[in-house]
């Protein structure tokens, strides 16, 4: 469970894959899109508001009581829209909502290079948001090796 | 309870190499980014070393890079650093500490006792 | 590298008194910095996280502030057990200790 309704802190990035590819979002016939794209010189990156919140570790099992916290994220280009995980679809959407914010809209926070993090979908563990023909999906990893496979990590710039 | 438990301290001569070794409890070691820190006599804390979970990315500062590794066997629930060509600006007090949450290398949320490292001929 | 620049290296306060302690970044760590509490021959202890967050346990009377580049300890009230030396550190980029604030009995 998130141990508070209030994000722990919050950080305005701009969003980018390890490979430099820019995450952009583009307002189409009243939603959102999201695309993968190379910017060109000097075209302004879109900025993610990412706010952290705690959570305690799901698994009993941990033996770390209450100690074993993570940190999960929410993701939002745009005033009142997030990031969803659509695990049916295995797709990364944009979804208008109000606050309390459903599970689909928190991610696990990793970050298995000091300068790259990944998003874990709360909702189905071991799914993690990532880059799949210029558009972002989501990706099964089988195991912790597979964590920094490149098409799952994300660098988060203020620039 | 969380517990970290470091040994391998001692006397070594200037050019020589040690291991540290730090037994971690009460926690899943695998989850978690840990660190090794220091503190030279009367001084402050210096970061000398960073390890991700799986342990396949490590990190280093200037002072200590190509002379120390950091490892980790995440079965044995133990953290390493082994320490060669050491200088006698190494001699300090060598903590080792785990990340604050799984998964991140965010905040150092516990901290061992130390062991004492002097380097002196 | 980052650079952490704290002030003042020591200071001297009684007890009751407010205490504020600054840290500054040679660049932006956005709010990612932590404050430390050691006390002589023990192992540091983590008393804020993020710039602004409690450890659990750790006494009201402990505060935090900043972002960027300035951030600041703030002890309102000073307590017998408050005597020790603290560290900030950064982890934005890297991960940086400042060189530390000893708070001394005057």
């Known amino acids: 469970s998130i141990t508070g309704i209030s994000p722990i802190t919050e950080y305005l990035a701009s969003l980018s894959t390890y490979n430099d590819q820019s995450i952009t979002f583009a307002l189409e016939d009243e939603s959102y899109e999201i695309y993968v794209e190379d910017l060109k010189k000097d075209e302004k990156k879109d900025k993610v508001l990412l706010s952290y919140y705690e959570s305690q570790h799901p698994s009993n099992e941990s033996g770390d009581g209450v100690d074993g916290k993570m940190l999960m994220v929410t993701l939002s280009p745009t005033k009142d829209f997030w990031l969803h995980a659509n695990n049916k679809e295995h797709s990364v959407e944009l979804h208008k909502c109000e606050k309390p914010l459903p599970d689909q809209a928190f991610f696990v926070l990793h970050n298995m290079h000091s300068n790259c993090v990944s998003f874990e979908c709360k909702t189905d563990p071991g799914v993690f948001i990532g880059v799949k023909d210029n558009h972002l999906a989501l990706i099964k990893v089988d195991s912790s090796e597979n964590l920094c496979t490149e098409n799952i990590l994300f660098k988060l710039s203020e620039t | 309870e969380v517990q970290l438990v470091e040994s391998g301290g001692g006397l070594v001569q200037p050019g020589g190499s040690l291991r540290l070794s730090c037994a971690a409890s009460?926690?899943?070691?695998?989850?978690?980014?840990m660190y090794w820190v220091r503190q030279a006599p009367g001084k402050g804390l210096e970061w000398v070393a960073s390890?991700?979970?799986?342990?396949?990315?490590?990190y280093y500062p200037d002072s200590v890079k190509g002379r120390f590794t950091i490892s980790r066997d995440n079965a044995k629930n133990s953290l390493y650093l082994q320490m060669n060509s050491l200088r006698a600006e190494d001699t300090a007090v060598y903590y080792c500490?785990?990340?604050?949450?799984?998964?991140?290398?965010?905040?150092?949320?516990?901290w061992g006792q130390g062991t004492l490292v002097t380097v002196s001929s | 590298d980052i650079q952490m620049t704290q002030s003042p290296s020591s200071l001297s306060a009684s007890v009751g008194d407010r205490v504020t302690i600054t840290c500054k970044a040679s660049q932006n760590i956005n709010k990612h910095l932590d404050w430390y509490q050691q006390k002589p021959g023990k192992a540091p202890k983590l008393l804020i996280y993020f710039t602004n967050n409690l450890q659990t346990g750790v006494p009201s009377r402990f505060s935090g502030s900043g972002s960027g580049t300035d951030f600041t300890l703030t002890i309102s009230s000073l307590q017998p057990e408050d005597f020790a030396t603290y560290y900030c550190?950064?982890?934005?980029?890297?991960?940086?200790f400042g060189g530390g604030t000893k708070v001394e009995i005057k």
């Open positions: 550190f950064q982890y934005n980029n890297g991960w940086t």
């Open positions: 009460g926690f899943t070691f695998s989850s978690y980014w």
């Open positions: 500490a785990r990340g604050h949450y799984y998964y991140t290398s965010y905040s150092l949320g516990y």
């Open positions: 390890i991700t979970p799986d342990g396949g990315n490590t």
